[in-house]
């Protein structure tokens, strides 16, 4: 089969287009010439905002390591949104 396609059976008389993983899902196993893409749901703490045949789930940004706080929670399709900490003056 051509690049981007895979055999539909052992006989390989026919080929089908690799599928992509939808937003909220990441690639668990990249397709080969004889097998389709295997997708997995992004677990808590990870996200995918694209439809892709290659992209894995990405971890949420760690706001703390940037000395920021979480302004908007992440989902399986979106990253967290970080913002400045509100520092109270003494």
């Amino acid at each position: 089969c051509e690049e981007g396609w895979h055999c539909t059976s052992e006989a390989c008389e026919s080929c089908v287009l690799h599928r992509s993983c939808s937003p909220g899902f990441g690639v668990k196993q990249i397709a080969t010439g004889v097998s389709d893409t295997i997708c997995e749901p992004c677990p808590v703490g990870f996200f995918s905002n694209v439809s892709s045949a290659f992209e894995k789930c990405h971890p949420w940004t760690s706001c703390e390591t940037k000395d920021l706080v979480v302004q908007q929670a992440g989902t399986n399709k979106t990253d967290v949104v970080c913002g400045p900490q509100d520092r109270l003056r003494a």
């Epitope: 051509e2 690049e3 981007g4 539909t8 059976s9 052992e10 006989a11 008389e13 026919s14 089908v16 287009l17 599928r19 992509s20 389709d36």
Partner: antibody, heavy 115, light 112 residues
Framework: EVQLQQSGPELVKPGASVKMSCKAS????????MHWVKQKPGQGLEWIGY????????NYNERFKGKATLTSDKSSSTAYMELSSLTSEDSAVYYC????????WGQGTLVTVSA | DIVMTQAAPSVPVTPGESVSISCRSS???????????LYWFLQRPGQSPQLLIS???NLASGVPDRFSGSGSGTAFTLRISRVEAEDVGVYYC?????????FGSGTKLEIK
């Protein structure tokens, strides 16, 4: 000679389900996926999805997830499509096709949804 | 989803003349493998669709060489030279590069 013989017309009531068939002959059934295509009266073509009889893998157009269920039976070389919770929007001719980009299509099954 | 646009719902033509049918896609149909997955089908009245042309310009088996296809990227054309009465029907373009596969709305060829 490759042939795809589809089941006859169906008149069904709103809310009901219907299951149509596509019997393949003239080739090794498990070597090709079977696609399904919808055509509403006087309108264009819409890809529903495919079933791979070799491993029962299915791939659906998101628009038809929950509406169409694609299956196959190796022993009879037949692919099936079941449509559920029918409405007037589901009234159409449904085609099966061995390889969407190939030359073998069934003659179509007309589904009419009417009270 | 990739949107396939066939701007002309119908084209009238006199037998023996030539006609062109256009199709545009909302994104490029060029795959990273170098192939462009654009197909043309003809649906004659009361019949199932039949493949005419694959990958822009490759004629399907049994299709007369009066039919030809051209284009690249997002713009494609089906040309029929010396139109015959048997050519009447609706012509559809289809993309096969990305799920879900999508068809144009069709262009009806009518004999004047």
């Amino acid at each position: 000679e490759v042939q795809l013989q589809q089941s006859g017309p169906e008149l069904v009531k709103p809310g009901a389900s219907v299951k149509m068939s596509c019997k393949a002959s003239g080739y090794t059934f498990t070597n090709y996926v079977m696609h399904w295509v919808k055509q509403k009266p006087g309108q264009g073509l819409e890809w529903i999805g495919y079933v791979n009889p070799y491993n029962d893998d299915t791939n659906y157009n998101e628009r038809f997830k929950g509406k169409a269920t694609l299956t196959s039976d190796k022993s009879s070389s037949t692919a099936y499509m079941e449509l559920s919770s029918l409405t007037s929007e589901d009234s159409a001719v449904y085609y099966c096709a061995r390889e969407l980009t190939g030359t073998y299509w069934g003659q179509g099954t007309l589904v009419t949804v009417s009270a | 989803d990739i949107v396939m646009t066939q701007a002309a719902p119908s084209v009238p033509v006199t037998p023996g003349e030539s006609v062109s049918i256009s199709c545009r896609s909302s994104k490029s149909l060029l795959h990273s493998n170098g192939n462009t997955y654009l197909y043309w089908f003809l649906q004659r009245p009361g019949q199932s669709p039949q493949l005419l042309i694959s990958r822009i310009s490759n004629l399907a088996s049994g299709v007369p060489d009066r039919f030809s296809g051209s284009g690249s990227g997002t713009a494609f054309t089906l040309r029929i030279s010396r139109v015959e009465a048997e050519d009447v029907g609706v012509y559809y373009c289809m993309q096969h590069v990305e799920y879900p596969f999508t068809f144009g709305s069709g262009t009806k060829l009518e004999i004047k």
